[in-house]
């Protein structure tokens, strides 16, 4: 056959769907690879062809669209399963072609099982709620396009094995789950089960997401440098190891990049000749506030090094701060015999 632009296996789109549930999968060509949409392609006389390779097989085979009750069907650029079966797992390819043009992409589809409490190997999206921030909502994700707006589905929300009915501060409101005032105790996995009728059959869509309660922007502050500070003086003799920790607290801020860096005499450590190493560690609080520690280390410090300016810098979306470390050379202890002799008036 003639050449086809093959985009290969798009592993970025590792699609996971639950067994025995409907699934609608759009051909990724139009979303990520081509500059035109399905309607344009269709009106230009291009045809979309689907085929698949079963799990642990190498053989590409056409998809059987003649199964009972149209279990697998295609509608425009969407491949439909009503519902999926465990052995639908495999690599699926959509190919757009006519006599002069061809483009195709493959993607993996994994059909996964869940237990009665909705545990499964499914990768869960994380939704962050601000602590004690007033009413916040999460919405049952990825259910658009499964049923027309005229159909009114029933939606049931669960936390683990338990249907949410009368939680203290969590209220199911159809497709939304409202948190009146989010607390750490609201951390966990929440599942919505959407039930809808179609052609005399009842289908269920199960969607689980992880709720993580994080620090509120109301409480956010610019970075706070705990160390170095004015109370600690790094007093060293030449030849000793100099260790200065820079410890910075960052309030949680959605999508903020937290940065910590040292300057020595106003330059980045990489830009100067002294043998300096910097080790970083990061820890998080329960609400994802962050503490970063960068330890500046000079194995054998020289008297020159002890005269330099060591400044710790920190930056977040809330602002930038800096603090100099107090570094000085230790004054050698007076030699006892000499002092004693001087004291007795010896010359």
């Amino acid at each position: 056959s003639e050449r086809c632009d093959d985009w290969g296996l798009d592993t970025m789109r590792q699609i996971q769907v639950f067994e025995d549930e409907p699934a609608r999968i759009k051909c990724p060509l139009f979303e990520h690879f081509l500059k035109f949409n399905y309607s344009t392609a269709h009106s230009a006389g291009l045809t979309l062809i689907w085929y698949w390779t079963r799990q642990d097989r190498d053989l590409e085979e056409p998809i059987n669209f003649r199964l009972p009750e149209n279990r697998i069907s295609k509608e425009k650029d969407v491949l439909w399963f009503r519902p999926t079966l465990l052995n639908d797992t495999g690599n699926y390819t959509c190919m757009l072609r006519n006599t002069t043009y061809c483009s195709k992409v493959a993607f993996p589809l994994e059909v996964v099982q869940k237990d009665s409490c909705f545990n499964s190997p499914m990768k869960l999206p994380v939704h962050k709620l601000y602590i004690e921030y007033g009413i916040q909502r999460i919405t049952c994700p990825n259910v658009d396009g499964y049923f027309p707006s005229s159909v009114k589905p029933t939606i049931t929300w669960y936390m683990g094995c338990y249907k949410i009915q009368n939680f203290n501060n969590v209220i199911p409101e159809g497709m939304n789950l409202s948190f009146l005032i989010a607390l750490i105790s609201n951390n966990g996995n929440y599942t919505c089960v959407v039930t809808y009728p179609e052609n005399g059959r009842t289908f269920h869509l199960t969607r689980t997401l992880t709720v993580k309660v994080v620090g509120s922007p109301k409480n956010a502050v610019p970075p706070v440098i705990h160390s170095p500070n004015d109370h600690v003086v790094y007093e060293k003799e030449p030849g000793e190891e100099l260790l200065i920790p820079c410890t910075v607290y960052f309030s949680f801020l959605m999508d903020s990049r937290n940065e910590v860096w040292w300057t020595i005499d106003g330059k980045k450590p990489d830009d100067i000749t002294i043998d300096v190493t910097i080790n970083e560690s990061i820890s998080h609080s329960r609400t994802e506030d962050e503490t970063r520690t960068q330890i500046l280390s000079i194995k054998k410090v020289t008297s020159e090094d002890l005269k330099r300016s060591y400044v710790c810098h920190a930056r977040s979306a809330k602002g930038e701060v800096a603090k100099a470390a107090k570094v000085k050379q230790k004054v050698p202890a007076p030699r006892y015999t000499v002092e004693l002799a001087c004291g007795f008036g010896a010359t």
Partner: antibody, heavy 122, light 107 residues
Framework: QVQLVQSGAEVKKPGSSVKVSCKAS????????IQWVRQAPGQGLEWMGY????????DYAQKFQGRVTITADESTSTAYMELSSLRSEDTAVYYC???????????????WGQGTLVTVSS | EIVMTQSPATLSVSPGERATLSCRAS??????LAWYQQKPGQAPRLLIY???TRATGIPARFSGSGSGTEFTLTISSLQSEDFAVYYC?????????FGQGTKVEIK
């Protein structure tokens, strides 16, 4: 390991109420459910209801709706089951049970209390 | 609610022999079934969940099988401490329901 310790045996008159306690001890995940199950002499196990102490949610078996109240005191890690309008057929051993978390499918009755015998007799 | 029916009501077995207990659900419960053991004067103890997974500390002589509506608990070689009452429980649908129990007694 988590342990559940229940209050002692009770003898009650028909028409009165009984309140059985269940205290959890040992290291524990903060979010779990406490189940209540009863067993009449020589009979099988009958689920009565549950509470999720941290979220205050309760649910009761239809048979006991209106007669049973399950509560919890988080500060003392204690759950309570109160059954009112007692009759002779409520004579049974009442058990509390729990899992480690809300998410353990099939293990929500993993840890059991020792049981409390409630005798209803005039 | 789902009705769980256990059979037989009583099973007489000699020590060292195999015991097979049955549990039937009035509708499919998938693999969402647990088995409990209860000795006189004691609380029940979880043996099996997910129809076939042994709970922590349960000896390998206990095994569970089945899915849908038909389930089996097998004790491969009965020990003296295994003579007790065994209950199945479904947790597929609320309310979670127990069977009426099978008493395993010494023959």
């Amino acid at each position: 390991q988590v342990q559940l310790v229940q209050s002692g045996a009770e003898v009650k008159k028909p028409g009165s109420s009984v309140k059985v306690s269940c205290k959890a001890s040992g290291p524990s995940n903060p979010v779990y459910a406490i189940q209540w199950v009863r067993q009449a002499p020589g009979q099988g196990l009958e689920w009565m209801g549950y509470i999720i102490p941290l979220h205050g949610q309760v649910d009761y078996a239809q048979k006991f709706q209106g007669r049973v109240t399950i509560t919890a005191d988080e500060s003392t890690s204690t759950a309570y089951m109160e059954l009112s309008s007692l009759r002779s057929e409520d004579t049974a051993v009442y058990y509390c049970a729990r899992g480690q978390t809300l998410y353990d499918s099939g293990r929500q009755f993993d840890i059991w209390g020792q049981g409390t015998l409630v005798t209803v007799s005039s | 609610e789902i009705v769980m029916t256990q059979s037989p009501a009583t099973l007489s077995v000699s020590p060292g022999e195999r015991a097979t207990l049955s549990c039937r659900a009035s509708q499919s419960v998938s693999s969402n079934l647990a088995w409990y053991q209860q000795k006189p004067g004691q609380a029940p103890r979880l043996l099996i969940y997910g129809a076939s997974t042994r709970a922590t500390g349960i000896p390998a002589r206990f095994s569970g099988s089945g899915s849908g509506t038909e389930f089996t608990l097998t004790i491969s070689s009965l020990q003296s401490e295994d003579f007790a009452v065994y209950y199945c429980q479904q947790y597929n649908n609320w309310p979670w329901t127990f069977g009426q129990g099978t008493k395993v007694e010494i023959k």
